[in-house]
Amino acid sequence: VPRWRQQWSGPGTTKRFPETVLARCVKYTEIHPEMRHVDCQSVWDAFKGAFISKHPCNITEEDYQPLMKLGTQTVPCNKILLWSRIKDLAHQFTQVQRDMFTLEDTLLGYLADDLTWCGEFNTSKINYQSCPDWRKDCSNNPVSVFWKTVSRRFAEAACDVVHVMLNGSRSKIFDKNSTFGSVEVHNLQPEKVQTLEAWVIHGGREDSRDLCQDPTIKELESIISKRNIQFSCKNIYRPDKFLQCVKNPEDSSCTSEI
């Protein structure tokens, strides 16, 4: 008799999930000498242990603590780039500006980037059919809790000037419900962080408008100021030129704001 399986609203675990995590771990530790000591099999075991045999709507941050411990990593706290709804450009930027780091440039972020996973209560099986959707099913699902945990830790580690890349093509440039708005903003440490500098990325279309005056940016400024952190904002009017100028800062066309 086939066992009844909970049908969730979200996509199932990414195919070849265990192999992908293990392969990514090996690759990361080879590229980053400071993480060479990491035992990738132990990392996978800790990752698996966080969600296997557990109800995928009852996952807690504590479930991920063994993985967090194994993935402990020191990044320069004054070189952190947060992002919201504009992951690709943020990653392109840190690929060029090698001394800056997004969460996905750390081991744990790199392992889980773009992956989905969940298990089932009381069975050691991984659910490849469906996983809980944050909105339609539950927020305490394995993927959401993972990102909440690593995002909180990443924000807590930040110091001096923290940068955040925001998508100017969205109706809410700053969204209180995003991971940045709901987790990272509230976990920046005022005793360590002097300034949050927002980079508002304009869409492909040419525009002269100052999106730093957007009401949602004013809302972000208010939240940050109340936490005794200074706030500044810059428009990135031409993202393509911005990246080009990061690559070639000596270029004569790179003197004006982009």
Epitope: S169, S171, E206, S208, D210
Partner: antibody
């Protein structure tokens, strides 16, 4: 060819409201182009009221018009709207909608709607 | 707000003559993205404005090459090399470098 078709003239009494419409016949471009509203008063030249980006509903207002005007857009009918409240004789003018041709450049203008406010 | 000042108020010209209209802004229109958002429009009696020149010197589609624009910073000029009867009307400059967009008071081009 007509690209922006505005509603007909309106006569209103002081204190009332009026809602003007501007239909864009280029349905491809309408959602992702800012639509501005500009008014022209005799002897006062042109005044920019504000603009809206229909697909995401982003709105900018001229400071002078923040409490006077309300912009709106419907991407199904490709129509932009300007609502003017608490009308006074000072609001008597021709109101134009104008869609940007390139970023931040008003390239295409409607024929204008005359609003007359009189007791 | 940026104030746009046009001179002259009225410009009588003969057909075939050259006409020159000046526009001055109260602050630089060079935007931090490298563009200068200064534009010229023509409004004929009973009609809505038509875009002639955008970003200082670019002719909008369908605009004859007798119209040209120049300038930088705060000083700009529209030139019509050989005035034709259809060019008569009121010319406006406008800036969209800084919100709110603002307009010049207009220059009326009329036949001498």
């Amino acid at each position: 060819q007509v690209q922006l078709q505005q509603s007909v003239s309106e006569l209103r009494s002081p204190g009332s409201s009026v809602k003007l419409s501007c239909k864009d016949f280029d349905s491809e471009v309408f959602p992702t182009s800012y639509m501005s509203w500009v008014r022209q008063k005799p002897g006062h030249g042109f005044e920019w009221i504000g603009d809206i980006l229909p697909n995401i509903g982003r709105i900018f207002y001229g400071e002078k018009f923040e409490d006077k005007a309300k912009l709106d857009a419907d991407t199904v009918s490709n129509t932009a709207y300007l609502e003017l409240t608490s009308l006074s004789s000072e609001d008597s003018a021709i109101y134009y909608c104008a869609r940007e041709a390139y970023g931040s450049i008003l390239g295409y203008w409607g024929q204008g709607t005359l609003v007359a406010v009189s007791a | 707000d940026i104030v746009m000042t046009q001179t002259p108020l009225s410009l009588p010209v003969g057909l075939g003559d050259q006409a020159s209209i000046s526009c001055r802004s109260s602050q630089s229109l060079l935007h931090s993205n490298g563009n200068t958002y200064l534009h010229w429009y023509l409004q004929k009696p009973g009609q809505s404005p038509k875009l002639l020149i955008y970003k200082v010197s670019n002719r909008f589609s369908g605009v004859p090459d007798r119209f040209s624009g120049s300038g930088s910073g705060t000083d700009f000029t529209l030139k019509i090399s050989r005035v034709e009867a259809e060019d008569l009307g009121v010319y406006f400059c406008s800036q969209s470098s800084h919100l709110p967009w603002t307009f010049g008071g207009g220059t009326k081009l009329e036949i001498k």
